[in-house]
């Protein structure tokens, strides 16, 4: 039997990834820096499939259901060219209908649909955040 890798204390494991949900308020850049500070190649989380989105949403809903959460998706050139900060391919998308526009170039999991959909928001807003790494 293959031994499952372990995650850092307080992080949860699912399908070869470790996830850390932090209920502290950070702007997007500071949240990313804090994720990196935990080591192991951690970044703000990429969400690459409906399967992964559902697992994360279920986990977070066990803690709270009202606060949006930063993920690792951003639009660094401010041209609606979104990319994952960890370099993952931007294929799966889960934008809610009213996501884009304004000075909103960072993505959050929205509490409006149980964290299954994303909205863009101003990157300087201070919010909870989700980190991810491969152990």
């Amino acid at each position: 039997q293959i031994q499952r890798p372990s995650c850092a204390p307080g992080w949860f494991y699912h399908k070869s990834n470790c996830y850390g949900y932090f209920r502290k308020l950070r702007n997007w850049s500071d949240a990313e820096l804090e994720c990196q500070s935990y080591g192991n190649g951690a970044h703000l989380a990429s969400i690459l499939s409906l399967k992964e989105a559902s697992t994360i949403a279920e986990y977070i809903s066990g803690y709270q259901r009202s606060q949006p959460i930063w993920i690792g998706l951003h639009d660094p050139q401010k041209r609606q060219q979104w990319q994952w900060i960890d370099g993952a391919m931007y294929l799966y998308r889960s934008w809610s209908g009213k996501s884009m526009g304004g000075n909103k170039h960072c993505a959050e999991m929205s509490s409006n649909n149980n964290f299954l959909t994303w909205s863009s928001n101003e990157c300087n807003k201070r919010q909870h955040f989700l980190c991810k790494y491969r152990p």
Epitope: I2, S16, L48, E52, L91, S94
Partner: antibody
Framework: EVQLQQSGAELVRPGASVRLSCTVS????????IHWVKQRPEQGLEWIGW????????QYASKFQGKATATSDTSSSTVYVHLSSLTSEDTAVYYC?????????????WGQGTLVTVSA | DIVLTQSPATLSVTPGDGVSLSCRAS??????LHWYHQKSHGSPRLLIK???QSISGIPSRFSGSGSGTDFTLTINNVETEDFGLYFC?????????FGAGTKLELK
């Protein structure tokens, strides 16, 4: 090379049940979900549900709740679907399928299908 | 549940023709739409993922486009091996759903 090998055709009586198998080779069965898909004769595809062989967790389309039950045996890299209280509406080809890796949702790998015929 | 409506139900073409198959979703599914081809008595085969992403080993005559609710699969210069059923599938939300299919047949 990833392969999904399904069990052979079944002829079953109305009201009976049947268990179909899908044996996976070429990747670790615990790394992703295995899905089941139904195709009735000359018709489209219907998603039945998935199982996570690592945990045994399952999710089903509401239409198949109580009709289909997915299980797995990681030691033999095999997943099963149990179909109960069979009627003529359950006559179909059943496919197991999976994605290329956990971070994707499209069905890359398919079994060859198992034909289930429900007839008196 | 998200309903996928494919049109036309049947398309009669001659080899060498170009064709477009439509898949319309009952609500926005972003770009989370995949296309499959199924020959008679065979298993489905993935052609295009996430609306427009090509698949290794699939001929370049197959291409996809669209986002939101309207999607198109285009086949340039249809070959005889392309005849059969084409299905779209969404992975935007559970339950996963498929379209009823478009049958591509020889004129």
């Amino acid at each position: 090379e990833v392969q999904l090998q399904q069990s052979g055709a079944e002829l079953v009586r109305p009201g009976a049940s049947v268990r179909l198998s899908c044996t996976v080779s070429g990747f670790n069965i615990e790394d992703d979900y295995i899905h089941w898909v139904k195709q009735r004769p000359e018709q489209g595809l219907e998603w039945i549900g998935w199982i996570d062989p690592e945990t045994g967790n399952t999710q089903y389309a509401s239409k198949f709740q109580g009709k289909a039950t997915a299980t797995s045996d990681t030691s033999s890299s095999t997943v099963y679907v149990h179909l109960s209280s069979l009627t003529s509406e359950d006559t179909a080809v059943y496919y197991c399928t999976t994605t290329s890796y956990y971070g994707s949702d499209e069905f890359v790998y398919w079994g060859q299908g198992t034909l289930v015929t429900v007839s008196a | 549940d998200i309903v996928l409506t494919q049109s036309p139900a049947t398309l009669s073409v001659t080899p060498g023709d170009g064709v477009s198959l439509s898949c319309r979703a009952s609500q926005s599914i972003n770009n989370n739409l995949h296309w499959y081809h199924q020959k008679s008595h065979g298993s489905p085969r993935l052609l295009i993922k996430y609306s427009s992403q090509s698949i290794s080993g699939i001929p370049s005559r197959f291409s996809g486009s669209g986002s939101g609710t309207d999607f198109t699969l285009t086949i340039n210069n249809v070959e005889t091996e392309d005849f059969g059923l084409y299905f779209c599938q969404q992975s935007n939300s559970w339950p996963l759903t498929f379209g009823a299919g478009t049958k591509l047949e020889l004129k």
